[in-house]
Interface confidence: medium
């Protein structure tokens, strides 16, 4: 092309025009391009109408053209990703009809002071959100309910001052969300939801430690492995998490987490009692939370909970029985184990009542993995690694998931605009998944012992899964034999929401409780 | 069956140019990505251009500039203008067809000989 | 451009045996977005066009026997031919599909012991 670079990567034709000062889309482009470079250049406004003769365009990077005026007219049916940071924009353009398959939608660094009700209407494939740098103060309390889909959400460095309460409801995928640099001075009840949310970034915010914060403050405990600082050019599984890097902005940079809160109502911080059956009177003792009530009430949907009930295992049975294929970031321990910090299971438990079905039936059937066929054009290039589909509720263990998207932020000063360094063909809904290894199953019976006053720590271990048993019925802190196979006692089904940041987990696994 | 039948190679002094033709049958031709690779005598493979099912050529540089790849799809015909040929264009020329929209080579002509010599 | 380095440049072999060739790539040819390895084999006799064997570094083109198959992730590939058989000997070459241009192997050549 006599103006632009012109190339093919993986099934991909990617034209290249950035930093060629133009003032319009440059004439006769591939027409089967799927990847738009139009960065750096003096567009000042753009009409999308422009780009619909290229039918198979699944990425337009249209940062730092100076634009201030995005017309959204026609439509570009397969473009998943939008690229629309560092410009002049001082309202989102409701692109829901134009761009329905949209998984990718970067708005970072522009100056949009405000997002009506239904800006994000019709974005139902969103993935990935990014208003990262604009003039922010408040949001509509249903922004997000046309994207249920989404997973990756940053409104850091924005002049936030609150939050609306069900921001996040339905948010069943969302995996990271960013928050910092706003002026955020408490974070409403309920905020959180039950959902699993394994990166949350949430410092330079001022936040006021009074009796409301003690909400957030119990959620922090609870998720304190969840809570990072953002480093620039830093990838987000390299960084170590941090909650002591949320503060209170009243109290001399006091961690949240650590908020005494004398004074408050016993049950001050316990939010809707579906989101956490709070412990009224607790010792703290390091990462150690001593319970003093024997009731534990477990959520139906998964939540971040690290203080799972305590389990005595022996020794033995950890040296042998161990999965020989442990994730790289899994170790084997022979210390005792608890549930994983994110890992919660379905069932309220009560220690006055509980047994297992006799006969569990274990399985090491998984499922089969989803393939692709090609060619097919691809509706999200953006993402730069592959992502699970979305799990199944099922008990039956599936393939380990594949390795999460590599960063939050594709748009950080002075970082390059986002590109897609390793586009396909294959569309993102349904990847090829790696082979799957069937699940060991531990066999062996020591003793459970659940105590009223148990010790509870969030380090632990996942062991392994078997299919799922129900609660029936009553025994009273001890559990006595019971009539089943002698190497094989009894389960606890947990469901994990979103599992592709977890370095342990498949959403279909539950932990093996034997007897 | 797939057949690809290249014709035009032949001798040519350098800077002078050459046409090869690639007449393909066996399968719809307008939907597949067609290519030119070559092989010089006693050497391995490279590839000479290509051009998407919607018309859209690529090169290496090795060619950039002298070589063009066309495509006729009324007459299921691949085409490669060689201009301003050196002595290093001295090859088989096979055209090769392509896999959907992938870049490997699924089946090849027998190819056609370019000797490019004064 | 991606270079591509196979090893050995020639190898001398017998019906039966086992063979094995290597091919290294500059860069990884993994396209993480959807697992795949952007590598392909074909095997060349004298005087004819290549064949394709495999592509995707491990997916046996149809009609290619068994015997034939291909490993490998990123920047190291591996194609084996568990028993030779006298039609085999011939020059095999790797490709990488991932990035244009599209790079060709030097070759390896299996002649018979």
């Known amino acids: 092309h006599p103006i632009c670079e012109v190339s093919k990567v993986a099934s991909h034709l990617e034209v290249n025009c950035d930093k060629r000062n133009l003032t319009a889309l440059p004439p006769d482009l591939p027409k089967d391009t799927t990847i738009l470079h139009l960065s750096e250049n003096l567009l000042y406004t753009f009409s999308l109408a422009t780009l619909m003769p290229y039918t198979r365009l699944t990425q337009l990077n249209l940062d730092r053209c100076e634009l201030t005026k995005l017309q959204v007219d026609g439509t570009l049916p397969v473009l998943g990703t939008l690229d629309l940071s560092h410009n002049q924009l001082q309202s989102l353009p409701l692109l829901g009809q134009t761009l329905p398959a949209l998984t990718v939608l970067d708005v970072s660094f522009n100056r949009l002071t405000s997002l009506p009700l239904g800006a994000l209407r019709g974005l139902g494939e969103l993935q990935e959100l990014y208003l990262k740098g604009n003039e922010l103060k408040t949001l509509p309390p249903g922004l997000l309910t046309p994207t249920p889909k989404l997973e990756k959400l940053s409104l850091a460095n924005n002049n936030l001052t609150e939050l609306p309460a069900g921001l996040l409801n339905g948010l069943e995928n969302l995996d990271t969300l960013l928050l910092q640099e706003n002026s955020l001075y408490t974070i409403p009840k309920g905020f959180f939801g039950s959902h699993l949310l394994p990166f949350a970034f949430l410092h330079g915010n001022p936040w006021l430690c009074n009796c409301e914060i003690l909400y957030f403050r119990r959620w922090l405990q609870d998720n304190a492995e969840n809570v990072y600082v953002w480093k620039q050019g830093v990838d987000v599984k390299a960084m170590t998490s941090n909650v002591a890097s949320v503060q209170c902005d009243n109290s001399d940079k006091f961690p949240v987490y650590k908020y005494p809160g004398k004074g408050c109502p016993t049950l001050g911080d316990e939010g809707d009692t579906d989101l956490y059956d709070y412990y009224p009177e607790e010792d703290t003792e390091g990462d150690k939370v001593r319970a003093t009530r024997t009731v534990v009430k477990f959520p139906t949907k998964a939540h971040t909970t690290p203080w799972g009930l305590f389990y005595s295992w022996s020794t033995a049975s950890l040296d042998s029985q161990m999965p020989s294929s442990l994730h790289p970031t899994q170790e084997s321990t022979k210390e005792q184990t608890t549930f994983p910090p994110r890992w919660t299971p379905n069932f309220t438990l009560h220690m006055e009542s509980i047994t297992f079905s006799k006969t569990p039936k274990s399985t090491t059937e998984p499922t089969p993995s989803p393939t692709t066929s090609e060619p097919v054009p691809e509706p999200a290039p953006n993402m730069t690694t592959l992502e699970p589909t979305p799990s199944p509720t099922t008990p039956e263990p599936t393939s380990e998931p594949a390795p999460s998207p590599t960063t939050p932020e594709p748009t950080s000063e002075p970082a390059p605009s986002p590109t897609t360094p390793e586009p396909t063909s294959e569309p993102a809904p349904s990847p090829t998944t790696p082979e799957p290894t069937p699940i060991p199953t531990i066999a062996t019976s020591p003793t459970i012992l659940v105590s009223a006053t148990s010790l509870i720590t969030p380090k632990s271990t996942f062991l392994t899964t078997t299919k799922p048993v129900s609660l029936l019925e009553s025994t009273k802190k001890t559990i006595p034999e019971l009539d089943q196979p002698p190497k094989l006692r009894g389960v606890l089904q947990g469901h994990l929401e979103s599992s592709r940041n977890d370095p342990f987990l498949h959403p279909d696994f539950c932990c093996l409780l034997p007897l | 069956e797939v057949q690809l039948v290249e014709s035009g190679g032949g001798l040519v002094q350098p800077g002078g140019s050459l046409r090869l033709s690639c007449a393909a049958s066996?399968?719809?031709?307008?939907?597949?990505?067609m290519s030119w690779v070559r092989q010089a005598p006693g050497k391995g493979l490279e590839w000479v251009s290509s051009?998407?099912?919607?018309?859209?050529?690529y090169y290496p540089d090795s060619v950039l500039g002298r070589f063009t790849i066309s495509r006729d799809n009324s007459k299921n015909t691949l085409y490669l203008q060689m201009n301003s040929l050196r002595a290093e264009d001295t090859a088989v020329y096979y055209c090769a067809k392509s896999r959907g929209y992938e870049d490997y080579f699924d089946y090849w002509g027998q190819g056609t000989l370019v000797t490019v010599s004064s | 451009d991606i270079q591509m380095t196979q090893s050995p440049s020639s190898l001398s072999a017998s019906v039966g045996d086992r063979v094995t060739i290597t091919c290294k790539s500059s860069q990884s040819l993994l396209n993480s977005r959807n697992q795949k390895n952007y590598l392909a084999w074909y095997q060349q006799k004298p005087g004819k066009a290549p064949k394709l064997l495999i592509y995707?570094?491990?997916t046996r083109e149809s009609g290619v026997p068994s015997r034939f198959s291909g490993s490998g992730s990123g920047t190291d590939f591996t194609l084996t031919i568990s028993s030779l058989q006298p039609e085999d000997f011939a020059t095999y070459y790797c490709q990488q599909h991932y990035s244009s241009p599209w790079t060709f192997g030097q070759g390896t050549k299996v002649e018979i012991k």
């Open positions: 051009i998407t099912s919607a018309g859209t050529p």
């Open positions: 066996g399968f719809t031709f307008s939907s597949f990505a």
């Open positions: 995707f570094t491990s």
